[in-house]
Interface confidence: medium
């Protein structure tokens, strides 16, 4: 271009459809200059105008020659320019914020603007820059980019921003600008100008001075508090911790808390202090609800479902901020809400859900929700498999007969389609418990009944019951215990009977033992004793319990004695015993020794003995009839241990083994014995029968059985020189070599001659008896031999 011709042609577009081209006028031209602008290769491509810019339709790709003729008073000048889209700048129109609003409760700004997309021919990406400024000094807080797309229509755009500082704390300004990133445009792209600024500020009321108020926040978050004050704020505390003040407009201040700690249930206090006042708020720092743990559902009665769960990690939020729970069943669409009043039991929460007719499968979702978030747990449950029956109530026991009872109880619920497995605990006094399992068909009316047999008559039982469904999920709790005495039955056996002749041989004394409770089958009231021979049967009068003995005058003929026990129901089978013994001439008295507590008796098997064996025992020193006690053992036995609390060590007892056939008893063995042998309690009495110059004849007596305290095994005779009333007197002093001892093992020997003695010498004699239980005390004597003649 020549100097003095139009120069510096530049073109811009704000919508890609129209280019706005402008140039600088030739130097020296005044106002009245006209221009002719011609665009090469265009029909009607010349334009007359009076200003230095022209709007032309956007040119398609390629180079275009633009001729500008300037017509003015001094003549004309022409300039030629080459114009290409690449030389054009795309500068969007300045955007305008249509609306800026705020939600002060959430400290959120809401922005609304129009993209004026209808003026653009193509879809284009748009980048928006949004600038947030704070305080009167317009400090930049946030610069964000936001992407949208132009779609040929005017589109309203919304954008929101949550402020880290409550919006009440300071004025907030917002500006926007845009950049159109059109793929169809090859020229330079530039940012629009910033929009006119919009602002949001809070109109203070007289009450609230500190923001935010009663905020619920996630533990570990950062949060800003501020105090709107006319007076100077001196300090700020969160809990007991001082915080540095951040100055805002006027006297307003803020504090920033980083990584906030969990609050107590009453929240955490935030306090601002001025000279005259204290202003504050409460913050609740907690957690969103944890996923409900161990959600499980069961039913007690097939009418109502009980769902239990553990809330998991505590949220630290209570009251209106606590977690609320909703249990939704997805097949039916029904739901129930957890009421906060229903405080958790042992850390576990529970909800009841009414069962639905004909629905067995339930798909439960438990939703947990609090101000910080929500979570959920799901469970699919076949409720017929998850029955946890109530504790059986109204548990009753009724007699059927003496060995069977009827148990009845109440188990609330409609169990018509289900079977129960019930466990009955049967406890007899002083014995171990028995458990019986019974399967029972479930009913609609909650009343159940079962018969229990194989019990003992006249026995105190304690019953209790628990139930589960037969598929078993959980046992119910045990019912209350019920104590019950079964009814009496006739005694199952006759009494254990024995007989002895009186010492004068004229009377037969019949003894019997009380029946054990499991054979008595009731309270024994009396006994009937009868005696029969081939000719006659004679009955004694009824003998009331607890008398267990009767005496009958009998001759020595053979009689059968019968003893019958009676209770309120009836009589036992008779116990029979013959009055006379079956003779046995081939008997020797044997010695037996026990084992401290009892005595073991053994014998050879005898096939002739068909009823039983009887072992009878008595104290040897007692007068006739000899009977302390007896024991019956079965006929196939060949040994028994006899034990009794009456047995004493060192006491001699007589033991008799009888064998029985046809109710008659034959004495098979006669024994004397001790449970335990002791040493004799006395020494034998002895005397000197004869003395010579070189010998002494000593004679002694038997020790009585009571003092012997064991089987006599021998005597120890000690002798040595010794005089009465001297220190050399003690024969048994140890270390004396001149003392002689004679062990006499022939217990029938009652005399002893001591020879080879010295004449006219004093001798000390000592005699002791011994058993297997030890050596008895000593008896001593001093004897002087005669003088040698």
């Amino acid at each position: 271009q020549k100097k003095g011709a139009p120069h510096d042609l530049k073109c811009v577009t704000n919508n890609l459809q129209v280019w706005d081209c402008y140039w600088k006028a030739p130097s020296g031209t005044g106002r009245g200059t006209d221009y002719e602008v011609c665009i090469e290769n265009r029909s009607h491509s010349c334009y007359q105008l009076e200003k230095t810019n022209i709007k032309i339709p956007a040119l398609s790709h390629g180079d275009y020659e633009i001729t500008i003729n300037s017509l003015h008073d001094f003549g004309s000048s022409t300039s030629k320019f080459t114009l290409n889209e690449q030389n054009v700048s795309l500068i969007p129109d300045t955007p305008e914020i249509l609306n800026l609003s705020a939600d002060f409760s959430t400290s959120t700004l809401y922005l609304k603007w129009n993209d004026r997309g209808s003026v653009f021919p193509h879809h284009s990406n748009v980048i928006w820059e949004i600038k947030i400024l704070r305080k009167e000094s317009m400090e930049l807080v946030k610069l964000v980019t936001h992407n949208t797309t132009l779609n040929g229509k005017d589109t309203l755009h919304h954008w929101s921003w949550a402020s880290d500082m409550p919006l009440e704390c300071a004025i907030h300004f917002v500006e926007i600008r845009c950049y159109i990133d059109s793929l169809h445009f090859s020229g330079r792209k530039e940012w629009s100008d910033w929009s006119p600024v919009k602002n949001i500020s809070w109109m203070p009321d007289s009450q609230t001075k500190v923001f935010p108020q009663d905020k619920v926040i996630l533990v570990g978050s950062d949060i800003t508090f501020c105090c709107i004050s006319q007076e100077k704020v001196l300090s700020a505390l969160i809990g007991h911790t001082n915080c540095p003040l951040i100055h805002l407009d006027g006297e307003n201040v803020a504090i920033k808390i980083h990584n906030i700690s969990v609050s107590a249930s009453s929240g955490t206090n935030v306090v601002f202090t001025t000279e005259d006042n204290i202003f504050g708020t409460v913050i609740f720092a907690g957690y969103p609800p944890d996923t409900p743990q161990q959600l499980n559902c069961e039913t007690h009665d097939l009418k109502e479902i009980l769902c239990r769960w553990n809330p998991g990690r505590a949220t630290a939020l209570v009251g209106p901020r606590a977690t609320s729970y909703t249990l939704l069943e997805s097949f039916s669409g029904k739901y129930v809400r957890f009421k906060r009043a229903e405080a958790p039991t042992n850390g576990s929460y529970q909800l009841f859900f009414q069962m639905l007719p004909n629905q067995e499968i339930y798909n439960f979702t438990l939703n947990a929700h609090n101000p910080l978030g929500r979570s959920e747990s799901t469970i699919l449950v076949n409720i017929t498999e998850k029955v946890y029956p109530h504790t059986p109530t109204s548990f009753k026991v009724k007699d059927i007969n003496s060995t069977a009872v009827k148990l009845s109880w109440h188990l609330p619920g409609n169990f018509a389609k289900i079977n129960f497995l019930c466990q009955i605990e049967i406890k007899k006094s002083n014995t171990v418990q028995e458990q019986r399992n019974v399967t029972i068909k479930g009913v609609e009316n909650s009343s159940y009944l079962v018969a229990l047999d194989k019990l003992n008559p006249y026995t105190v039982y304690t019953f209790r019951i628990r139930c589960s469904t037969e598929t078993f999920w959980k046992w119910s709790k045990w019912s209350n215990k019920k104590q019950h005495l079964t009814t009496e039955a006739i005694p199952s056996k006759g009494p254990d009977t024995w007989r002895e002749w009186s010492s004068d041989g004229k009377n037969l004394i019949i003894y019997w033992k009380p029946l054990p409770i499991n054979e008595a089958n009731g309270k024994i009231l009396s006994y009937n004793v009868s005696c029969s021979s081939d000719e006659e049967t004679q009955s004694l009068s009824e003998i009331p319990d607890p008398q267990h003995k009767a005496e009958i005058q009998l001759d020595k003929n053979d009689y059968i004695i019968s003893v019958v026990a009676k209770n309120s129901v009836g009589s036992s089978p008779p116990s029979k015993i013959a009055s006379m013994e079956i003779p046995n001439d081939d008997l020797k008295i044997e010695q037996v020794v026990g084992m401290g507590k009892g005595i073991l008796l053994t014998w050879h098997y005898d096939p002739n003995m068909t009823c039983d064996y009887v072992i009878k025992w008595c104290n040897s020193s007692r007068s006739e009839p000899c009977l302390m006690d007896w024991r019956k053992v079965p006929s196939n036995s060949t040994e028994t241990v006899i034990e009794s609390d009456q047995f004493r060590p060192g006491v001699r007892y007589n033991f008799f083994l009888y064998g029985c056939r046809n109710q008659g008893y034959q004495l098979l063995r006669s024994m004397i014995g001790y449970i335990e042998e002791l040493a004799p309690t006395v020494a034998p009495n002895f005397t000197v029968e004869d003395t010579s110059a070189d010998s002494i004849l000593v004679k002694w007596e038997d020790i009585p059985v009571e003092e012997l305290r064991g089987f006599l095994r021998g005597y120890l005779f000690y002798f040595g020189k010794g005089e009465r009333d001297t220190s050399k007197m003690r024969v048994l002093e140890s270390g004396r070599s001149d003392i002689k001892v004679k062990n006499i093992t022939d217990i029938s020997q009652k005399t002893l001659r001591i020879a080879d003695l010295q004449g006219k010498t004093s001798y000390h004699l000592v005699l002791r008896a011994y058993t297997d239980g030890g050596v008895g005390p000593e008896k001593s004597m001093y004897v002087v031999t005669k003088e040698n003649s």
């Epitope: 499980n296 469970i379 076949n382 037969e470 598929t471 078993f472």
Partner: antibody, heavy 116, light 110 residues
Amino acid sequence: QVQLVESGGGVVQPGRSLRLSCVASGFTFSSYGMNWVRQAPGKGLDWVTVIWFDGSNKYYADSVKGRFTISRDNSKNTLYLQMNSLRAEDTAMYYCARGERTLDLWGQGTLVTVSS
Amino acid sequence: DIQMTQSPSTLSASVGDRVTITCRASQSISSWLAWYQQKPGKAPKLLIYKASSLESGVPSRFSGSGSGTEFSFTISSLQPDDFATYYCQQYKSFSPGGLTFGGGTKVEIK
């Protein structure tokens, strides 16, 4: 998605021990009873053991009683089977399966071979 | 222990056939019975529970019936995807023997 994944199988000598794991995902593990079921090569299914949702009840087949122990860690969504004193007849594919009784979700199984 | 006897052990059939498998319990198990399908190399899949209830997502051609000790499982019209082994399982009680499965029935192509 809802699934069970077993691991821990392998070849082991008779008398030795092995521990199987089963990791659950996609459902609330702590709300369900869990089983181990095994299948010897070419044979049918053989139930081994079950544990209640909260670990309160455990039941075992007679053939493994006293040797195998089932346990669970609800915080890790994991079921375990501790197998001691292993025998040749314990050789099988071991599956973990969800449910106290009806087994509505099964893992792909882990193979245990007991051989000297 | 409750024993489960399944019959037949193998069954040959053609696509479109109606197929029935039976399962007998050694003592009454009410309706506590499930049926499973297992394909080679795969885990079993629950089809029927409580003797006759169809598991969610299982085609209606599968059905079950019976109670007490006698149970049957029917595929009304056999499809190519149904060739597999089928097991019954009682779940009445864990005590003394626990859950028990039948020996299985292999349904193969005739």
